[in-house]
């Protein structure tokens, strides 16, 4: 079941949608570019992406600091219950933009800006990323991370935009964790009804990669829920 606004938008955002993504960035001064394409089911909350490092590879840092920018930022693919306005789906065809800061426990910082538009029936994502202050002996530069734990993004309206906050945890090869506080602001390019506060439960997995992580495939499942909802669904 979908809301009235989404019903109108279903002519624009189909049951099955493709996307293209281009990222340019630098981490501790190392510049790179990534191209990718993906597909998914916006009303079911699932998406996959195939990504390729086109410049600056192989990357001298952990892929995991990049992975959320492709999918945690691909917000049109989040499943929403009918009574939560799907702010970002409703932003189309004009689309939306977002900015994010990820503060890691060892002082590393990632800032990201993204533009989401719709062209010829496909989502187009343009991403810029800058990572700074990652210690050379830390888990990111030593590539000791092993993917993100499932997380819950707390969404709430503020100043005419939708804010998201997550405490994210990266798994480490030695069995420990490496934490990041993530804040994102999402803004539609046209006036759109904002939801109240709710959560988006997210599980992001690297499903395949080559040895040097210059070709990577990712899968994400994401679902909006009222603040009481648990995360069990993501593991099914």
């Amino acid at each position: 079941m979908v809301s009235k606004g989404e019903e109108d938008n279903m002519a624009i955002i189909k049951e099955f949608m493709r996307f293209k993504v281009h990222m340019e960035g630098s981490v501790n001064g190392h510049e790179f570019e990534i191209e990718g394409e993906g597909e998914g089911r916006p009303y079911e909350g699932t998406q996959t992406a195939k990504l390729k490092v086109t410049k600056g590879g192989p990357l001298p840092f952990a892929w995991d600091i990049l992975s959320p920018q492709f999918m945690y930022g691909s917000k049109a693919y989040v499943k929403h219950p009918a009574d939560i306005p799907d702010y970002l789906k409703l932003s189309f065809p004009e689309g939306f933009k977002w900015e994010r800061v990820m503060n890691f426990e060892d002082g590393g910082v990632v800032t990201v800006t993204q533009d989401s538009s719709l062209q010829d029936g496909e989502f187009i994502y343009k991403v810029k990323l800058r990572g700074t202050n990652f210690p050379s002996d830390g888990p990111v530069m030593q590539k000791k991370t092993m993917g993100w734990e499932a997380s819950s993004e707390r969404m709430y309206p503020e100043d005419g935009a939708l804010k998201g906050e997550i405490k994210q945890r990266l798994k480490l090869k030695d069995g420990g964790h490496y934490d990041a506080e993530v804040k994102t602001t999402y803004k539609a390019k046209k006036p759109v009804q904002l939801p109240g506060a709710y959560n988006v439960n997210i599980k992001l997995d690297i499903t395949s990669h080559n040895e040097d992580y210059t070709i990577v495939e990712q899968y994400e499942r994401a679902e909006g829920r009222h603040s009481t909802g648990g995360m069990d669904e993501l593991y099914k």
Epitope: W98, E99, G160, A161
Partner: nanobody, 126 residues
């Protein structure tokens, strides 16, 4: 029309603090990055700090890093520059500017900023 009005400048002793404000009108403030620039007598205008539309992304000139903090209030349509540990070499006219597009990303060039305020004088005495 677009208006940017700076305030908060003045005379302060070295080591002191000032907080500059830039009140804006005539455009959708929350869609645009904002910057602060300064011009000392006989010198070129130089980049001081900038902040993205959301406030998540900030950038500072090396000479002010750790001493100055840029912030914004998207409800009040105002951008601020908190200046601590001021030095005589910070003496200048400080102007705020709005980025030409919403896609600002760490650009420091005057050319990336389109609308400018008249500026406010900051004088730091020894």
């Amino acid at each position: 029309q677009v208006q940017l009005v700076e305030s908060g400048g003045g005379l302060v002793q070295a080591g002191g603090s000032l907080r500059l404000s830039c009140a804006t009108s005539g455009f959708t403030f929350s869609d645009y990055a904002m910057g602060w620039f300064r011009q000392a007598p006989g010198k070129e205008r130089e980049f001081v700090a900038a902040i993205s539309w959301s406030g998540h992304v900030t950038d500072y000139a090396d000479s002010v890093k750790g001493r100055f903090t840029i912030s914004r209030d998207n409800v009040k349509n105002t951008v601020y520059l908190q200046m601590n540990s001021l030095k005589p070499e910070d003496t200048a006219v400080y102007s705020c500017a709005a980025a030409k597009s919403g896609t600002w990303w760490y650009q420091r060039s005057e050319n990336d900023f389109g609308s400018w305020g008249q500026g406010t004088q900051v004088t730091v005495s020894k």
